[in-house]
């Protein structure tokens, strides 16, 4: 399997609040001894490979932000801990799973991962994750609502 | 923070089976690999084996057909059992917490385990 | 399984001195190997994940690197506290193998 980023760039106001999404694609093992380990945290385009450092979204780190099911199960993260740094990361059943952060700020800005870990007991851990960038912007520059620029193409769409 | 602490028996006759628990406090139990570590004296660390929240195991095949390791979620605890042990099952015996495409981050403080009659 | 090989078996240095480690796998391991620390009498501690990421409140004197099969533990400055034995373990796949560890002691 791998996972898609629909969208590479994300360009938001200050005080907005953003979804970042990544995506499952291809066969997915819904097998008993199968499980699917997913989160979320920022990182750097390192000199080994984008998404190998593992920083902190807002004090929470991807251990606070895990999800962890099954295959075909949805989840989301715990709630209190998350909402109260006002995040929120979830999975659906389609193999979409997403973290929302709300009233951004500058600080915000940077390079977010999400990273996906099928676990074959008795075998191994296969990983894949995905890169895109977040830009918060302030000022008479800033859009009214988030600009968000697909992974293939240089279209932009607008998110209200 | 979560804690860890293991607790069993320090003596064990050989061919019996040693029984050790693992306690999980600060955290819940419902998420990662929950392993045990061992380690006999004057040798390095060996990995026997995890129990997944989801209740799938994994064991060291070395160590396979005398490994169970359970889990009590309502207790936030999990379990070792080695049957049939000898004397070089003699070691201090650790639980750990082992986070997916990560590392054992959480370790318990290590309980000695002596096989001798 | 994974074999890992760490060498020297011990290391006599002094305070102040530069510690170099070295851990060697059977196959690779992409860069999907920690270091852990143990004193006697204690639990071993994660110092560095992914060959090169250092866990959460680990000195920056401590450093990892490398990839594939070979892979290095760099102390750049060695504290008192330091003298431990150092060990390296492979993730890439299971059975989770560790390497017969590296002791730091005081020359």
């Known amino acids: 399997f791998k996972v898609a980023t629909p969208y590479s760039l994300y360009v938001c106001p200050e005080g907005q609040q953003v979804t970042l999404t990544c995506r499952l694609l291809g066969p997915v093992d819904k097998g008993h001894d199968v499980t699917f380990y997913k989160t979320w945290y920022r990182s750097s385009r390192g000199e080994v490979q984008t998404c190998s450092e593992r920083r902190p979204i807002r004090n929470l780190t991807f251990q606070d932000l895990h999800l962890h099911h099954g295959g075909h199960q949805a989840a989301n993260t715990s709630h209190d801990l998350a909402q109260r740094h006002g995040l929120e990361s979830a999975s659906d059943h389609h193999g979409q799973f997403s973290i929302t952060m709300r009233n951004l700020t500058l600080l915000d800005s940077g390079l977010y991962c999400c990273l996906v870990v099928e676990i074959r007991h008795h075998h191994s851990e296969h990983r894949v994750h995905g890169a895109m960038e977040l830009q918060v912007q302030t000022g008479k520059d800033a859009p009214s609502n988030c600009v968000v620029y697909p992974s293939s193409s240089q279209d932009s769409e607008n998110i209200t | 923070q979560v804690q860890l602490q293991e607790s069993g028996p320090g003596l064990v006759k050989p061919s019996e089976t040693l029984s050790l628990t693992c306690t999980v406090s600060g955290g819940s139990i419902s998420s990662y690999y929950w392993s045990w570590i061992r380690k006999p004296p004057g040798k390095g660390l060996e990995w026997i084996g995890y129990?997944?929240?989801?209740?799938?195991?994994n064991y060291n095949p070395s160590l396979k057909s005398r490994v169970t390791i359970s889990v009590d979620t309502s207790k936030s605890q999990f379990s070792l059992k080695l049957s049939s042990v000898t004397a070089a099952d003699t070691a201090v015996y650790y639980c750990?917490?082992?986070?997916?495409?990560?590392?054992?981050?959480?370790w318990g403080q290590g309980t000695m385990v002596t096989v001798s009659s | 399984e994974i074999v890992l090989t760490q060498s020297p078996a011990t290391l006599s240095l002094s305070p102040g001195e530069r510690a170099t480690l070295s851990c060697r796998a059977s196959?690779?391991?992409?860069?999907?190997l920690a270091w852990y620390q143990q004193k006697p009498g204690q639990a071993p501690r994660l110092l560095i994940y992914?060959?090169?990421n250092r866990a959460t409140g680990i000195p920056a004197r401590f450093s990892g690197s490398g990839s594939g099969t070979d892979f290095t533990l760099t102390i750049s400055s060695l504290e008192p506290e330091d003298f431990a034995v150092y060990y390296c373990?492979?993730?890439?796949?299971?059975?989770?193998?560790f390497g017969g560890g590296t002791k730091v002691e005081i020359k």
């Open positions: 196959q690779s391991v992409s860069y999907y």
């Open positions: 750990a917490r082992d986070i997916p495409a990560f590392a054992l981050d959480i």
């Open positions: 129990i997944y929240y989801s209740g799938s195991t």
């Open positions: 373990q492979q993730r890439i796949n299971w059975p989770l193998t």
């Open positions: 992914d060959a090169f």
